[in-house]
């Protein structure tokens, strides 16, 4: 896939394609992050990417398509 980003309140990459060991970006998170599909209400949450739900936090995150970044994959990477 591409870059994985959290909701607007958190920055940074979590993990990439399914199968990787995804760990959180904050020091308190030492265990793997577990995902499920985002509920239907988030169908259009990720502008240029796929939505995944962070199970422990009950929040959406985005796996961005190549060439895009941002919490909702809304920003174009001009250097891509």
């Amino acid at each position: 896939d591409g870059n994985t980003t959290r909701t607007p309140e958190t920055n940074g990459s979590l993990c990439g394609a399914p199968g990787e060991n995804c760990t959180g970006t904050t020091p308190r998170q030492k265990s793997k992050t577990h995902f499920s599909r985002c509920p239907k209400q988030y169908k259009h949450y990720c502008i240029h990417g796929r939505c995944r739900f962070v199970m422990d936090e009950q929040t959406p995150s985005c796996i961005c398509e190549k060439g895009y970044f941002g919490a909702r994959c809304e920003q174009v990477d001009l250097f891509y």
């Epitope: 399914p18 199968g19 990787e20 992050t33 995902f35």
Partner: antibody, heavy 119, light 107 residues
């Protein structure tokens, strides 16, 4: 081609144990969440347990504490360890691939293995 | 826990349209998937995400979902469509199946 093949079913007495296996081929097994779904004779489908690609496990209430789902990515195999078996666990057990993460749908199914719990 | 309710059986004349319903509280807010199962065989996904069709599934199969009811529609029903059909949704980190509907094709 993409394939799932269950094994390990059979006749077991109430209170006994059994371990089911599901051999996967034709896809990158470690990248997918997997589930077990069962079907009692003449009845409908019942989801039993799921295992995410990074290890998250979830179970239906009736098997919690008795069944354990696990996987060995090096062997492309999914397992279901069933302990303290009851007559109501009698069913055909299917292994199914979750499309991507949990919460999608089952796009690939095995042929099933029959578990009979009876004295 | 979340429940999905299906009619036990539905009959349709050969070549006519069959509709199988799946009812659940605010089911329109969930993704619904449909499986076909013939005797002695494993289930096969025929509709996913309310209305999308996997490759290899005839266009005669379609789905819709709104309010409290999801519907699987089979147009120009054929003898080979006779099977059990199950709806499925995801709720609170668990998978929920409907009880199943036996479709009988008459004639």
């Amino acid at each position: 081609q993409v394939q799932l093949l269950e094994s390990g079913g059979g006749l077991v007495q109430p209170g006994g144990s059994l371990r089911l296996s599901c051999a996967a081929s034709g896809f990158t097994f470690s990248s997918y969440a997997m589930s077990w779904v069962r079907q009692a004779p003449g009845k409908g489908l019942e989801w039993v347990s799921g295992l995410g690609h990074v290890g998250y496990t979830t179970y239906t209430d009736s098997v919690k504490g008795r069944f354990t789902i696990s996987r060995d990515n090096s062997k492309n195999t999914l397992y279901l360890q069933m302990n303290s078996l009851r007559a109501e666990d009698t069913a055909v057990y299917y292994c199914a691939r979750d499309y991507l993460d949990f919460g999608y749908y089952f796009d690939v199914w095995g042929q099933g293995t029959l578990v009979t719990v009876s004295s | 826990s979340y429940e999905l309710t299906q009619p036990l059986s539905v009959s349709v004349a050969l070549g006519q349209t069959a509709r199988i319903t799946c009812s659940g509280d605010k089911i329109g807010k969930k993704y619904v998937h449909w499986y076909q199962q013939k005797p002695g065989q494993a289930p096969v996904l025929v509709i996913y995400d309310d209305s999308d069709r996997p490759s290899g599934i005839p266009e005669r199969f379609s789905g819709s979902n709104s309010g409290n009811t999801a519907t699987l529609t089979i147009s120009r029903a054929q003898a080979g469509d006779e099977a059990d059909y199950y709806c499925q949704a995801w709720d609170m980190q668990s998978v929920v199946f409907g009880g199943g509907t036996k479709l009988t094709v008459l004639g």
